[in-house]
C-alpha cells in the first residue's frame, strides 16, 4: 500500500537540499514525548547535558524544547513538482545555546553547545507519518532518525518506508 | 505541473451518498498530506479532513467525523471523500488541496483543485 | 476551537489604494496564519503563510503581519486583478479555521 520509499528516493536530496533561509520561518516550544507518552528531558551533568526518556511523575512539569522551523529547498532534479518542492527542517534547543546534534559516528544524540550559523548536524527533516505524530530524520545522514533505544535517544537507521511508522522513531509534540 | 482534479459531484437526496475522487499529478502523490475543503455557496471555506497517502493517517474536522470517510489510492494517484447520511447543509463546492512542504502537514494549502458541487436537495 | 474574524465583511476600493484587511484569531495562534485570495468561481490561492511569508510567485504588493491574535494584510496598491475576497486562515493545527471573509470591490 506504500509508494516508492522515500527513504531511499531521496537519499541524495538531503545532502544537497539547501535552508532557503537562514530565519527559521516559525518557532515553538514544546515539551516532546514519545509515541508511549514517555517524556524526553535534560538534566545538567558535569557542566554537560545528559538526555533521558522516562516516565514523570504526576504533577511533574514536562521540559520544554525550543523547536525553530526552517524552510529547505528541495533539489528539483530529485523532485516531481519543481521548484516547489519544499521540506521543512527543525532544530531543537532546549535551552540556550544548547542544541541536539547527530552524531553518526556514534549513532547517538547529544546535546552541543554551539554558535549560529549552526552546522548540519543539528538540522532535522520534519516527517507527519500521523497528524499528531512527528519523526526527525537526520539531514546528514538519510534514512537515519532520532529514536528511543533503552530510555535514550539514539540515531535509528530505517530501511523502508513502511518502517517510517515504527513507534520508537515517532514523537509527540505538546505546546502545554 | 502540479494539478489536482476533483469529480463525482451531483445532486443527491437527504440521506444519500457520494463518493467524490481526486486525481493527483505532476508530484509524488505519496509525499504529501492532501486535504478536502469544501465552500457552501456564497459562504466561506471549511476544512473536511486530511491524508497522508504513504501512512494512510487521517485526521479529521470533528464535525464531518462519523458520516465522512477519506482515504486513497497510490497506485492510481487519488484521493476520495466518501459522504454518508447526506444533509442540505452540505451543499457546497468541495475542493481538493495540498501543502507545500513534503512529509509534513502544516494544513496551509498550497495547490488546490477546480472543485465538484454537490447539492443535496430532495 | 479558535475562531478568526475578519474586518472589515466587505470593502470598496480604487485601484493604486493602499488597502488592509485585519483577521483577529480568539486565542494566541502565534504566527500560524495564511491568507488566500479567492475570485468567483475559482479555487483559492495561497498568498502568505505563517503571518508575513509571501508564497512563490504571489507579487510583492501583497505582505502580512501580526502574531498572536491581530494579524494584516496589506496590498500597498490595489490592481485591476486585485478585486477578490480575501480569507485568513489559523495554519499548523487542527482543526484549521477560516475567517469569513473580506471581499474588495471596486469604487
Known amino acids: 500500500a506504500f509508494g516508492i520509499s522515500g527513504v531511499q528516493k531521496y537519499t541524495r536530496a538531503l545532502h544537497d537540499s539547501s535552508i532557503t533561509g537562514i530565519s527559521p520561518i516559525t518557532e515553538y516550544l514544546a515539551s516532546l514525548s514519545t509515541y508511549n507518552d514517555q517524556s524526553i528531558t535534560f538534566a545538567l551533568e558535569d557542566e554537560s547535558y545528559e538526555i533521558y526518556v522516562e516516565d514523570l511523575k504526576k504533577d511533574e512539569k514536562k521540559d520544554k524544547v525550543l523547536l525553530s522551523y526552517y524552510e529547505s529547498q528541495h533539489p528539483s532534479n530529485e523532485s516531481g513538482d519543481g521548484v516547489d518542492g519544499k521540506m521543512l527542517m527543525v532544530t531543537l534547543s532546549p535551552t540556550k545555546d544548547f542544541w541536539l546534534h547527530a552524531n553518526n559516528k556514534e549513532h547517538s544524540v547529544e546535546l552541543h553547545k554551539c554558535e549560529k550559523p549552526l552546522p548540519d548536524q543539528a538540522f532535522f527533516v520534519l516527517h507527519n507519518m500521523h497528524s499528531n505524530c512527528v519523526s526527525f530524520e537526520c539531514k546528514t545522514d538519510p534514512g537515519v532518525f532520532i529514536g528511543v533505544k533503552d530510555n535514550h535517544l539514539a540515531l535509528i537507521k530505517v530501511d523502508s518506508s513502511e518502517n517510517l511508522c515504527t513507534e520508537n522513531i515517532l514523537f509527540k509534540l505538546s505546546e502545554t | 505541473e502540479v494539478q489536482l482534479v476533483e469529480s463525482g459531484g451531483g445532486l443527491v437526496q437527504p440521506g444519500g451518498s457520494l463518493r467524490l475522487s481526486c486525481a493527483a499529478s505532476?508530484?509524488?502523490?505519496?509525499?504529501?498530506?492532501v486535504s478536502w475543503v469544501r465552500q457552501a455557496p456564497g459562504k466561506g471555506l471549511e476544512w473536511v479532513a486530511e491524508?497522508?497517502?504513504?501512512?494512510?493517517?487521517?485526521n479529521f474536522n470533528e464535525n464531518f467525523k462519523g458520516r465522512f470517510t477519506i482515504s486513497r489510492d497510490n497506485a492510481k494517484n487519488s484521493l476520495y471523500l466518501q459522504m454518508n447520511s447526506l444533509r442540505a447543509e452540505d451543499t457546497a463546492v468541495y475542493y481538493c488541496a495540498r501543502g507545500p512542504y513534503y512529509y509534513s502537514t502544516q494544513i496551509i494549502f498550497a495547490y488546490w483543485g477546480q472543485g465538484t458541487l454537490v447539492t443535496v436537495s430532495s | 476551537d479558535i475562531q478568526m474574524t475578519q474586518s472589515p465583511s466587505s470593502l470598496s476600493a480604487s485601484v493604486g489604494d493602499r488597502v488592509t484587511i485585519t483577521c483577529k484569531a480568539s486565542?494566541?495562534?502565534?504566527?500560524?496564519l495564511a491568507w488566500y485570495q479567492q475570485k468567483p468561481g475559482k479555487a483559492p490561492k495561497l498568498l502568505i503563510y505563517y503571518a508575513s511569508n509571501r508564497y512563490t510567485g504571489v507579487p510583492s504588493r501583497f505582505s502580512g503581519s501580526g502574531s498572536g491574535t491581530d494579524f494584516t494584510l496589506t496590498i500597498s496598491s490595489l490592481q485591476p486583478e486585485d478585486f477578490a475576497t480575501y480569507y485568513c486562515q489559523r495554519i499548523y493545527n487542527s482543526p484549521p479555521t477560516f475567517g469569513g471573509g473580506t471581499k474588495v470591490e471596486i469604487k
Open positions: 486565542q494566541n495562534v502565534g504566527n500560524n
Open positions: 491524508i497522508y497517502p504513504n501512512s494512510g493517517a487521517d
Open positions: 505532476g508530484f509524488t502523490f505519496t509525499d504529501y498530506w
